[in-house]
């Protein structure tokens, strides 16, 4: 979370960003709020990056202003037009590049001052894991895929009964660069699984956090997963 | 839940002054404007002016300027709309509404002038 | 001031007509008009903003379109609940100003 002020006294305003990260051929929302106003026609909303000659994006006196805005970003941008009033500066990008990590600005002017605040955006790939058992293994082996993630994550298995155990000798992981030759598709292979147990999958890099989980018993299989963002620290 | 309850129902004499409060619960008070708007019989809704309680940000529509004061007790989460001088098309249901969408509105106040 | 012309004031038509109620902004608002329903004795609650943007919880018969100066707001399939007053009303610059209304009766 990063809050930004103004110039000073009255005439500043609050500009709160939070750091995000974006998923490449996704599309991404770059996180921004300011103190509203009660009127349209004074909002003025800027997003420049970095590095960047032209704006990323701009909206003032109540509709989209485009003619600066740099190529890279032409057509791939918007904000959320009914919650501009409401202080709402959100920028939504669409077809989120490789090149478009940066630091950005979200630069406000409203009737009652000006304020500004950076923003860390993060891209690369990142999904949900799936863990199967694979029963064309010669051994109760469990399998854990996940299509895309960029740039190259760890892959760690764990389990509920065997906490703390390392499972790099009994684990075989492997990355295929997919068709597009940026993102690879993460499969990883546990051997040696025990009945009653359940199992996790956890693939980290420096973006996301995601984990599969499995409990197999002898009547069922059970199957869980969920993926976080690693947003940078408060600043 | 957001709510935005109301002071119940005034007779005033012309020439009085008239406080209508509204208290705001279910959302944060102070990030949101707080706007004040009235109902006259068989007349559209006319826009009174509004407050940013986070800063005590002040509008208010010329035609009601020095006759009206807004003002919020932001440590009771409660705006204050006071209107004086009052003659007898000042009669009318008055509303607090939540942000500049207007998003969400109170029950309404009726305050009747007369002599 | 910005005046809102309403159209028409009152209406009536049957359970399952197309209802279109216009509004016409003095001066060019851009899309900074909300629409709002009020019933009876009751408040008026936010049905559509910035233009064509359906509120929270809003069913998917009501919505609205234009730009500038002039606004459309739909109702696709009227029904009985609907029986209100609409209202229209431009954030683009103040005195926000309103609509003077469009009471929808059922035949």
């Known amino acids: 979370l990063i809050i930004g002020f103004g110039i000073s006294g009255r005439h500043s305003i609050t500009v709160t960003t939070v750091a995000s990260a974006g998923n490449i051929g996704e599309d991404g929302i770059l996180s921004c709020t300011f103190e509203p106003d009660i009127k349209l026609s004074d909002i003025v909303i800027q997003w420049l990056k970095e590095g960047v000659l032209g704006l990323v994006h701009e909206f003032k006196e109540g509709k989209d202003e485009l003619s600066e805005q740099d190529e890279m970003f032409r057509g791939r941008t918007a904000v959320f037009a009914d919650q501009v009033i409401v202080g709402n500066a959100s920028l939504r990008l669409k077809n989120v590049q490789l090149t478009d990590a940066g630091t950005y600005k979200c630069y406000i002017i409203t009737s009652k001052g000006k304020g500004n605040a950076n923003l860390e955006y993060k891209t690369g790939a990142f999904s949900m894991p799936e863990v199967n058992v694979d029963y064309n293994a010669s051994s109760e082996t469990l399998r854990c895929e996940a299509p895309r993630w960029f740039p190259q994550p760890t892959v760690v298995w764990a389990s509920q009964v065997d906490q703390g155990a390392n499972f790099s000798e009994v684990s075989n992981t492997s990355f295929e660069l997919n068709s597009e030759n940026v993102t690879m598709k993460v499969v990883s292979v546990l051997y040696n699984v025990t009945i009653n147990n359940t199992y996790s999958c956890m693939i980290e890099n420096d973006i996301a956090k995601a984990t599969g989980d499995i409990k197999v018993t002898e009547s069922e299989i059970k199957r869980r997963s969920h993926l976080q963002l690693l947003n940078s620290k408060a600043s | 839940e957001v709510q935005l309850v109301q002071s119940g129902a005034e007779v005033k004499k012309p020439g009085a002054s008239v406080k209508v409060s509204c208290k705001a619960s279910?959302?944060?008070?102070?990030?949101?404007?707080m706007n004040w708007v009235r109902q006259a019989p068989g007349q559209r809704l006319e826009w009174m002016g509004g407050?940013?309680?986070?800063?005590?940000?002040?509008e208010y529509n010329e035609k009601f300027k020095g006759r009206v004061t807004i003002t919020v007790d932001t440590s009771a989460s409660t705006a204050y709309m006071e209107l004086s001088s009052l003659r007898s098309e000042d009669t009318a249901v008055y509303y607090c509404?939540?942000?500049?969408?207007?998003?969400?509105w109170g029950q309404g106040t009726l305050v009747t002038v007369s002599s | 001031d910005i005046v809102m012309t309403q159209s028409p004031s009152s209406l009536s038509a049957s359970v399952g007509d197309r209802v279109t109620i216009t509004c016409k902004a003095s001066?060019?608002?851009?899309?900074?008009v909300a629409w709002y329903q009020q019933k009876p004795g009751k408040a008026p609650k936010l049905l559509i903003s910035s233009t064509s943007y359906r509120y929270t919880g809003v069913p998917s018969r009501f919505s609205g379109s234009g730009s500038g100066t002039d606004f459309t707001f739909t109702i696709s399939s009227l029904q009985p609940e609907d029986i209100a007053t609409y209202y229209c009303q431009q954030h683009y610059s103040t005195p926000l100003t309103f609509g003077g209304g469009t009471k929808v009766e059922i035949k």
């Open positions: 001066q060019d608002v851009r899309t900074a």
């Open positions: 279910g959302y944060t008070f102070t990030s949101s404007w």
């Open positions: 407050i940013y309680p986070n800063r005590g940000n002040i």
């Open positions: 509404a939540r942000d500049s969408r207007f998003s969400y």
